[in-house]
Interface confidence: medium
C-alpha cells in the first residue's frame, strides 16, 4: 500500500511539473503576446499621430491656399472693374505692389537717377513714396533694407518739396544727423538736391544723378468700396 | 585679409569668347557690389561693368554692352565676366574691384588683374 | 556721360616736393570722387573716396579736396614711393568714369 502511494505521489509531482511547465509555456506566450500587441499598439499610436500631423498640416496648407486664392480672386475681380471702369478711381492694388495703409507701393531692384525713377512712378500713375508718418517710415524701411533708396522729395527748385504737394515744413522728417547740408543747392547744376532713404533709414540729400533704388507710391480711392467677390 | 584673385586670361582670336572669374576671401562677398576694370596696353583705365552685392542690378560701358555679362555666385563667392565676340580693341588687363557698397560707391579694393588678348 | 578731364597729364617733381594734380567733372557730382595711384605692371590703389576721405592704410601726406566740380589730390611731401601715375574717377552714376591719369616722374 505504502509502494502503491509513493508510485501516485510520483505521478502526480510529474502531473503538477507537466502543468507548471505547461503553465509557464502558456503565460511566456502571452507575455510574448502581450509584448507584441504593446508594440502593435504603440506603433498604431504612432501611426495615428502622423495622421493626424499631416492631416493638420494639410489643413493649414488647405487654408493658407483658399486664404491665397480668395486674396488673388478679389485682386482679379478688383483688377477687371479697373479695366472696365474709366480709370479713375483704384480700388485695389495693381500686381506685384504691396498693399499698406490704402496705398499700394512698388520696390524697385535696380537703380536709377532721381528724375528716372520719378519718371518711372509717374508713367505707372503713381509718384515716388511721400512719407507722412512714423509708421510709414518703418513700413518703407522695413521692405527696402539697408539700400539707398529714393523718396519723392527734393529741393531742385529750391525750398525742399514732396512731390505730390504735402507740406514739407509741417510734415514728417526722418533726416540724418547734419542733413541735409546743401539746402540750395551748391550751383552745381544737379547738386545734391534729391532725398534718400540711408542704410539705417534716415534720411540724407545727395546728387540726383545718382543711381539708386526707387519706391513708387500710389493711393488707394477714398471713396471706393471693395468689389464684391465674382 | 581681403583678397580679389582674377583668372581666366589668355590668348583669343577675334570673334570668339571667354569667361574671366574673380575669387574673393576676406569679406562677405554678398553684402558688396562688385566692378570689372580693364586697361589697354600703355592707356588709362576704362570701367567695364557693375553688379548689385544680390545681383539685382547690372550696368555695362557701352563699349561692351551686348557682347560682356557680368555675374556672380555668391555661394562660391566668385565673380564673373564672360566675354563674347571678342574684338582687338578688347585686350587689356582685366581687373576685378570691390565696391564698398552694394554697387554704387566706386571701388576700395582691387585684384591683381588677369591678361586678355585678342589676336588671330 | 559724365567726362572726367584731368591736369596736368604729366609732372616733374623731386623728392619732398609738394604736388598738386586736378580733375575736373563735365557735370555735378557732388563728393563721388575717389582718387588711385598705380604703379607699372601692377594693379591701381585706392587713396581717397568721397572726394577728401582718406582709404585706411594709406599715409596723410595724401589728401583730396572739392571746390565744385573741380578736384584736387595734394601729395604735401613727395617720396620715392610715390612716383606712380594717378587716376580720378567719378561714381556719381554709370557709366563710372575715369579721368585720362596724370603720371608723376622724378625731376
Known amino acids: 500500500q505504502n509502494a502503491q502511494l509513493q508510485r501516485e505521489l510520483r505521478g502526480l509531482r510529474e502531473t503538477l511539473s507537466n502543468f507548471t511547465a505547461s503553465t509557464e509555456a502558456q503565460v511566456k506566450g502571452l507575455s510574448t503576446q502581450g509584448g507584441n500587441v504593446g508594440r502593435k499598439m504603440k506603433s498604431l499610436e504612432s501611426q495615428l499621430e502622423k495622421q493626424q500631423k499631416d492631416l493638420s498640416e494639410d489643413h493649414s496648407s488647405l487654408l493658407l491656399h483658399v486664404k491665397q486664392f480668395v486674396s488673388d480672386l478679389r485682386s482679379l475681380s478688383c483688377q477687371m472693374a479697373a479695366l472696365q471702369g474709366n480709370g479713375s478711381e483704384r480700388a485695389c492694388c495693381p500686381v506685384n505692389w504691396v498693399e499698406h495703409e490704402r496705398s499700394c507701393y512698388w520696390f524697385s531692384r535696380s537703380g536709377k537717377a532721381w528724375a528716372d525713377a520719378d519718371n518711372y512712378c509717374r508713367l505707372e500713375d503713381a509718384h515716388l513714396v511721400v512719407v507722412t508718418s512714423w509708421e510709414e517710415q518703418k513700413f518703407v524701411q522695413h521692405h527696402i533694407g539697408p539700400v539707398n533708396t529714393w523718396m519723392g522729395l527734393h529741393d531742385q527748385n529750391g525750398p525742399w518739396k514732396w512731390v505730390d504737394g504735402t507740406d514739407y515744413e509741417t510734415g514728417f522728417k526722418n533726416w540724418r544727423p547734419e542733413q541735409p547740408d546743401d539746402w540750395y543747392g551748391h550751383g552745381l547744376g544737379g547738386g545734391e538736391d534729391c532725398a534718400h532713404f540711408t542704410d539705417d533709414g534716415r534720411w540724407n540729400d545727395d546728387v540726383c544723378q545718382r543711381p539708386y533704388r526707387w519706391v513708387c507710391e500710389t493711393e488707394l480711392d477714398k471713396a471706393s468700396q471693395e468689389p464684391p467677390l465674382l | 585679409q581681403v583678397q580679389l584673385v582674377e583668372s581666366g586670361g589668355g590668348v583669343v582670336q577675334p570673334g570668339r569668347s571667354l569667361r574671366l572669374s574673380c575669387v574673393a576671401s576676406?569679406?562677405?562677398?554678398?553684402?558688396?557690389?562688385m566692378h570689372w576694370v580693364r586697361q589697354a596696353p600703355g592707356k588709362g583705365l576704362e570701367w567695364v561693368a557693375v553688379?548689385?552685392?544680390?545681383?539685382?542690378?547690372?550696368n555695362y560701358a557701352d563699349s561692351v554692352k551686348g557682347r560682356f555679362t557680368i555675374s556672380r555666385d555668391n555661394s562660391k563667392n566668385t565673380l564673373y565676366l564672360q566675354m563674347n565676340s571678342l574684338r582687338a580693341e578688347d585686350t587689356a588687363v582685366y581687373y576685378c574691384?570691390?565696391?564698398?557698397?552694394?554697387?554704387?560707391?566706386?571701388?576700395?579694393?582691387w585684384g591683381q588683374g588677369t591678361t586678355v588678348t585678342v589676336s588671330s | 556721360d559724365i567726362q572726367m578731364t584731368q591736369s596736368p597729364s604729366s609732372l616733374s617733381a623731386s623728392v619732398g616736393d609738394r604736388v598738386t594734380i586736378t580733375c575736373r567733372a563735365s557735370?555735378?557730382?557732388?563728393?563721388?570722387l575717389a582718387w588711385f595711384q598705380q604703379k607699372p605692371g601692377k594693379a591701381p590703389k585706392s587713396l581717397i573716396y568721397?572726394?577728401?576721405s582718406l582709404q585706411s592704410g594709406v599715409p596723410s601726406k595724401f589728401s583730396g579736396s572739392r571746390s565744385g566740380t573741380d578736384f584736387s589730390l595734394t601729395i604735401s611731401s613727395l617720396q620715392p614711393e610715390d612716383f606712380a601715375t594717378y587716376y580720378c574717377?567719378?561714381?556719381?552714376?554709370?557709366?563710372?568714369?575715369f579721368g585720362p591719369g596724370t603720371k608723376v616722374d622724378i625731376k
Open positions: 576676406g569679406f562677405t562677398f554678398s553684402s558688396h557690389g
Open positions: 568721397a572726394a577728401s
Open positions: 557735370q555735378g557730382i557732388g563728393n563721388h
Open positions: 553688379i548689385w552685392y544680390d545681383g539685382s542690378n547690372k
Open positions: 574691384a570691390r565696391d564698398p557698397s552694394v554697387g554704387y560707391d566706386g571701388m576700395d579694393v
Open positions: 574717377q567719378q561714381y556719381s552714376n554709370y557709366p563710372v568714369t
